[in-house]
């Protein structure tokens, strides 16, 4: 019951999560920034990954898409490929976690089967979560050294003087939607990594203890245990540990009435 | 880099009226907003005009009434038209623009400057 619980949870946060990168990749609001200001009106200005817009006190809004902008920091790129890996390999995590999840019954899939899906999920969900956080912590680094770079550079130009204006810009909404969309996502996934532990079958190989009461030789054999989680198992009879007893392969033994098995 | 091409001054009587523009070209993201300053022979430079990329207007006090700023988008082109010209406004009239650069500071363009000189 615990396992199915943990399982579900992990589903439902990871499936949170990644609905939350889906919406921090395409948000406009990655930075934003006071472009200008006057008296009578300011000019606002919000980025995100794919454009960016302007916004006046007055009401005015126009948003542009970057295209093949040659003036785009590279590193622009690296995000928007880190938060499109998130988003696929989240989207196939919660594919296969549909069909790993313990309550959805497919055909006769046995519980090793389930206990591998809801591994690979799990492992899929962490790798998109740190996939989101780490696009989302190098735009926000990118935003920093930019704009530390660009402040009070001053040089001419061929139309003229040109001076960079000092702006004030914040981090956008995107960037914390994206870091804990991209938190809940890896949380998802440990989560599901755990319930994988409870989900695979226990398989023992518990050896013979017999007691032999025949006679005055008494025989007292400790076997070897082995709890597996159903990764590389001990699926055929072979000696784990025997405690420098034999078991009952090795060792002829007379049939009793006082035999136990 | 962005080019900026003022033209429209000169001389004018008192009284008079004048127009002038400016107009942008280069490799440019987006022009936010676009001004007008001048600067009288030993005084600093002041603000007269600017037009936002919406339309929005401001005219400083000494112009207000005076003066109208307009701008074609899509020429990427200002224009200051100045009626009732008194001699206290010769100066030399510069255009800027402030173009936005993404996730950079935006950058300031001055235009090299136009001289308008009202004197009978």
């Known amino acids: 019951m615990a396992v199915t619980a943990c399982q579900g949870l992990g589903f439902v946060v990871s499936l949170i999560g990644i609905a939350g990168i889906i919406a921090a990749t395409c948000m406009d609001q990655w930075s934003t920034q006071d472009l200008y200001n006057n008296p009578v009106t300011a000019v606002f200005n919000y980025q995100g990954l794919w454009r960016s817009c302007v916004r006046e006190s007055s009401g005015f809004t126009e948003c542009r898409g970057y295209f093949t902008l040659l003036g785009l920091p590279a590193m622009l790129q690296a995000v928007r490929a880190l938060m499109i890996v998130g988003i696929v390999l989240g989207a196939i995590g919660l594919l296969v976690s549909i069909f790993a999840l313990k309550c959805i019954r497919i055909g006769s899939m046995e519980d090793s089967a389930k206990a591998n899906m809801t591994l690979t999920s799990g492992i899929m969900f962490i790798v998109s979560g740190l996939c989101a956080i780490a696009g989302v912590s190098v735009f926000a680094n990118m935003l920093v050294t930019n704009f530390w770079m660009s402040t009070a550079n001053m040089y001419t130009g061929m139309g003229g003087m040109v001076q960079t204006v000092q702006t004030r810009y914040t981090f956008g909404a995107a960037l914390f939607v994206g870091w804990v969309a991209g938190g809940l996502t890896l949380i998802g996934g440990v989560m599901m990594c755990i319930a994988c532990r409870g989900l695979a079958p226990e398989e023992t190989n518990y050896k013979a203890v017999s007691y032999h009461a025949s006679g005055h030789s008494v025989a007292y054999k400790p076997g070897g245990f082995k709890a597996s989680t159903g990764f590389g198992s001990n699926t055929k009879n072979k000696k784990i540990y025997d405690g420098g007893a034999r078991t009952e392969d090795e060792v002829q033994s007379y049939p009793s009435k006082h035999d136990y098995v | 880099e962005v080019q900026l091409v003022e033209s429209g001054g000169g001389l004018v009587q008192p009284g008079g009226s004048l127009r002038l523009s400016c107009a942008a070209s280069?490799?440019?993201?987006?022009?936010?907003?676009m001004e007008w300053y001048r600067q009288a022979p030993g005084k600093g430079r002041e603000l007269v005009a600017t037009?936002?990329?919406?339309?929005?207007?401001y005219y400083a006090d000494s112009m207000k009434g005076r003066s109208t700023i307009s701008r074609d988008n899509a020429k990427n082109t200002v224009y200051l038209q100045m009626n009732s010209l008194k001699p206290e406004d010769t100066a030399v009239y510069y255009c800027?623009?402030?173009?936005?650069?993404?996730?950079?500071?935006?950058?300031?363009?001055w235009g090299q400057g136009t001289l308008v000189t009202v004197s009978s």
């Open positions: 800027n623009v402030r173009v936005e650069v993404p996730f950079m500071q935006p950058n300031d363009y």
């Open positions: 280069g490799s440019f993201f987006r022009i936010v907003a």
């Open positions: 037009i936002t990329r919406g339309g929005s207007t």
